[in-house]
């Protein structure tokens, strides 16, 4: 039988009446155009909705936008367009919402052609009031908040000026001209690239990387011959043009650009690219594009300094610069990532790693599924997940994979079961153990979302026809109930729930179409009465993450430790609640060779845990450039994996000697770097 239709499914009692009492409709007094929705703050219930309607006239486009505010998670909305003087808001800038619970909002207005600068509307009180501010420049990008101080904003102008505000957009100062890219770092530091000659495009590869730590009072040039730069975790990366040719290499700094080391990664040519797939304070996943228009490259994982890299995955699908990759961090379980590879026959297959890129495998075939037409052997195949690439190819995939840190172990994704991704209509699959095992959850494509930290999963069928039914599950997708939320079906456009998956409210967005007009409509459903009581201790059960063999002493050990979690029992219908905190108990493991990556000059042969010396370096002294000094490495080939917490057990020896010689790694050495003040 189809998922959720077998006789052991326990029904949630009287749910229709409970949900009907908690379903709130709001019809927006708008012609249908575009709609964007933003949550303001965490657990505040405040939502801002911006509707925009364009009327193309003969000479120009006439635009109208409206702003609505809810403070009860979308149950009721109030038109607050008058707070922004009925101004047309530029949707391409979106709504710039401040970090954390600052309650700050910046809206960028459309202004007439001849004006001196742009216009913004600012709120510091969760959009209860707005202040209009005329800008001394025309913004090119959305206002960017400093992660440390929401009063500090930066923006680039259409004339490539870097503008900074220290009082939440009230007053602006141009701190630098000829800026291509600017980013906030830690401690209110700003990194940016500048061009000297023509333009950002013309000077690509000849840009300078600058830093200011005092919002533009003083500057330091921290790099030259820059192609681009990026920040990931505690690492600052720059791709730098080589002296002799058109290739470029990645350099990395962990001290905000004061000193640099060349990353032990392949150089790339003009048509290739580097991409930081994921980064944290321990390490980075880096994609290096293959030469030629192959659509794939190689994933490398770094050591704790971002310098020594291990090859993690070959033939990694990544179409072009800024193109599509399926690389997904499974946030519901430590160490888990999913991505796609392009196999020799050009089919696309899904791979998963449970140990932060150490080893990749295919996804286990769901027990309740048959292998499809792509499978050579009908009894042996894998699950293949649809992600960004499938969506970009306009396959019938409405959503990318979903996981939430506070819904431990749960991963939901569209997929097909075979030897490769299929172009046939996908089904929805769920894993409750972070990707080790999978079950078909829903037949056909659906939109889905997680509520109450996993206590409820909500889904809506993806259909071209109007819909009026929502499905929900209180047992991690095993059994489903359907609820008709309106008599009059709507053309569905999206599901919206508060980020963080702690809410019990879901908003269904769509539009109604009649003979003469169409209007935006939202239905917000509160599931609080379905989960009638608060969860108690007895509702939680113990689960060991990454467990594959209970008999094994090292069972569950990943990156040197294992973690037991308290997880909601599937049979418990209760509220985790907004204040729910994931309960976990870590336990340190003994070290084995699996806890070490191969050091500089060493590699791991396939299916072997031992690191062996690279043949071309045998018998040579291992000397390399680090932080602008030449280092001599004494090693037996191992370096602890970043973030690995193992203790005892295997303990390979490693020693680095400073040779007290200077070297520059094709880059600025610290004493050549210059500073200047305004």
């Amino acid at each position: 039988s189809a998922p959720g239709e077998d006789e052991e499914c326990g029904r949630v009692r009287d749910f229709v009446a409970k949900l009907a009492n908690n379903t709130h409709q709001h019809v927006f007094d708008d012609l249908r155009g575009s709609v964007s929705l933003s949550w303001v703050g965490d657990s505040t219930g405040v939502i801002l909705v911006l509707t925009t309607f364009h009327v193309p006239l003969v000479i120009m486009t006439f635009g109208q936008s409206k702003l609505y505010r809810s403070e009860d998670y979308g149950k009721n909305f109030k038109d607050i367009t008058d707070l922004i003087n009925n101004t047309f808001i530029r949707t391409e800038f979106g709504m710039a919402i401040g970090p954390e619970n600052s309650g700050k909002v910046v809206l960028t207005a459309e202004v007439s052609g001849g004006s001196r600068g742009g216009r913004i509307f600012r709120s510091s009180d969760f959009a209860k009031n707005f202040v209009q501010t005329d800008l001394p420049f025309h913004p090119l990008t959305q206002m960017m908040y400093s992660p440390q101080n929401s009063d500090y904003l930066l923006a680039l102008s259409t004339e490539n000026g870097l503008w900074v505000s220290k009082n939440f957009g009230g007053k602006w100062e141009e701190i630098h001209k000829a800026v291509c890219l600017a980013k906030w770092g830690s401690d209110n530091t700003i990194f940016f690239t500048t061009y000297a000659n023509g333009s950002c495009k013309a000077d690509l590869g000849a840009l300078e990387l600058w830093r200011t730590s005092d919002l533009g009072k003083s500057f330091k040039t921290i790099g030259v011959k820059i192609y681009s730069f990026g920040l990931g975790g505690r690492f600052l990366f720059a791709s730098v043009m080589a002296d002799k040719d058109t290739t470029r290499r990645i350099h990395v700094s962990t001290d905000q650009g004061d000193t640099w080391s060349m990353a032990q990664l392949p150089s790339v040519g003009q048509e290739q690219f580097y991409s930081i797939l994921a980064a944290n304070d321990d390490m980075v996943f880096m994609h290096v594009d293959e030469p030629g228009d192959t659509g794939f490259g190689t994933i490398f994982t770094s050591d704790d300094r971002g310098i020594v890299y291990s090859k993690s995955l070959d033939r990694h699908l990544y179409t072009t610069t800024g193109g599509e990759t399926d690389f997904t961090n499974v946030t519901s379980l430590r160490g888990v990532y999913i991505t796609s590879v392009l196999s020799e026959d050009n089919s696309i297959q899904t791979m998963i790693t449970f140990d932060q890129g150490g080893r990749w495998t295919h996804l286990r075939k769901p027990e309740n599924s048959e292998c499809d037409a792509t499978a050579k052997n009908k009894n042996e195949c894998s699950l293949h997940i649809h992600a960004s690439y499938s969506i970009s190819q306009k396959l019938n995939v409405p959503m990318a994979p979903l996981s939430e840190p506070n819904a431990v172990g749960i991963v939901i994704a569209h997929g097909s079961v075979g030897d490769a991704i299929s172009v046939m209509v996908p089904d929805v699959y769920i894993s409750d153990d972070g990707g080790y095992s999978w079950t078909k959850m829903l037949e056909g494509p659906h939109y889905y979302t997680i509520l109450d930290s996993g206590g409820i999963i909500v889904a809506i069928e993806h259909s071209s026809r109007p819909i009026n039914v929502i499905k929900f599950s209180t047992d991690e997708g095993q059994c489903w109930q359907t609820y008709t939320f309106t008599r009059d079906p709507i053309y569905f456009t999206g599901l919206a729930s508060e980020p963080g998956a702690r809410s019990m409210n879901i908003s269904i967005w769509g539009f109604t179409e009649s003979f003469l007009t169409s209007q935006w409509v939202s239905y917000t459903i509160d599931f609080k009465d379905i989960l009638e009581r608060n969860c108690e201790e007895k509702d939680y059960t113990i689960w060991l993450a990454h467990s594959t063999d209970p008999e094994d002493y090292e069972d569950g050990c990943i990156l040197g430790y294992k973690e037991q979690f308290l997880r909601l029992r599937k049979s418990s219908v209760c509220q985790n609640g907004r204040d729910y905190v994931v309960t976990k108990q870590p336990s340190i493991c003994l070290c084995s060779l699996e806890d070490f990556l191969c050091d500089f000059g060493y590699y791991r042969p396939e299916n072997d845990s031992k690191c062996v010396e690279q043949p071309e370096l045998k018998g040579h002294d291992l000397e390399f450039c680090l932080y602008g000094r030449e280092e001599h490495l004494t090693t037996n080939g191992y370096r602890k994996i970043p973030g690995d917490k193992c203790q005892g057990g295997v303990n390979p020896v490693r020693e680095v000697k400073d040779l007290k010689k200077k070297c520059t790694s094709n880059f600025l050495s610290p004493e050549k770097q210059n500073s200047k003040s305004n």
């Epitope: 052991e8 326990g10 153990d433 080790y436 095992s437 201790e537 007895k538 059960t541 113990i542 689960w543 060991l544 993450a545 990454h546 467990s547 594959t548 209970p550 008999e551 094994d552 002493y553 069972d555 569950g556 037991q564 029992r569 599937k570 049979s571 418990s572 108990q585 336990s587």
Partner: antibody
Framework: QVQLVQSGAEVKKPGASVKVSCKAS????????MHWVRQAPGQGLEWMGW????????RYAQKFQGRVTMTRDTSISTAYMELSRLRSDDTAVYYC?????????????????WGQGTTVTVSS | DIQMTQSPSSLSASVGDRVTITCRAS??????LNWYQQKPGKAPKLLIY???SLQSGVPSRFSGSGSGTDFTLTISSLQPEDFATYYC?????????FGGGTKVEIK
Amino acid sequence: QVQLVQSGAEVKKPGASVKVSCKASGYTFGGYLMHWVRQAPGQGLEWMGWINPMSGGTRYAQKFQGRVTMTRDTSISTAYMELSRLRSDDTAVYYCARGKRSSGWYEGYGMDVWGQGTTVTVSS
Amino acid sequence: DIQMTQSPSSLSASVGDRVTITCRASQSISSYLNWYQQKPGKAPKLLIYAASSLQSGVPSRFSGSGSGTDFTLTISSLQPEDFATYYCQQSDVSPITFGGGTKVEIK
């Protein structure tokens, strides 16, 4: 092989306490829950609670809350169950039993290894 | 607490007979139902877990079925060593509860 060896029989007076030990061998002690179940003479089985040896966390049946304490010493792979304020109706055979696991899940799959039982007699 | 009701409380059967014992839960427990065999003076022994999975080392003449509230333990051909007391136990909701037991005696 996997086994649980319990301490010997005890005779206690009403109001006293008893502490029963259960030594595990042949498996990873921290990897499984340890349950305690008792059986009064001629009666059925009654679950008292469990201890999670990895974390030291416990869960007790409401009936025994406040009277039972479950502890463990991971260095010697031993679990303990102490019952205080003994009454004559606490006379029973007390068993420790390992919780069967299914992959990462610790509960729901029964108790697959049992100790030989410890007879506790409460009599004035 | 979930009540587990076993029936019959005792039964007499001969070697080779097919024996069925039922267990009913006071509310749905999905498939979290286990069966034990206990002989006098001995500790219980796990026979079936998760309603229908046979514990390793247990003869295949023992089988379990059911889900939700109604469960069955079947001994397809009773052997002399099978005369004992059988208990069902739910492990879906804390506290864990056992059925009252079914004593299988020689006819």
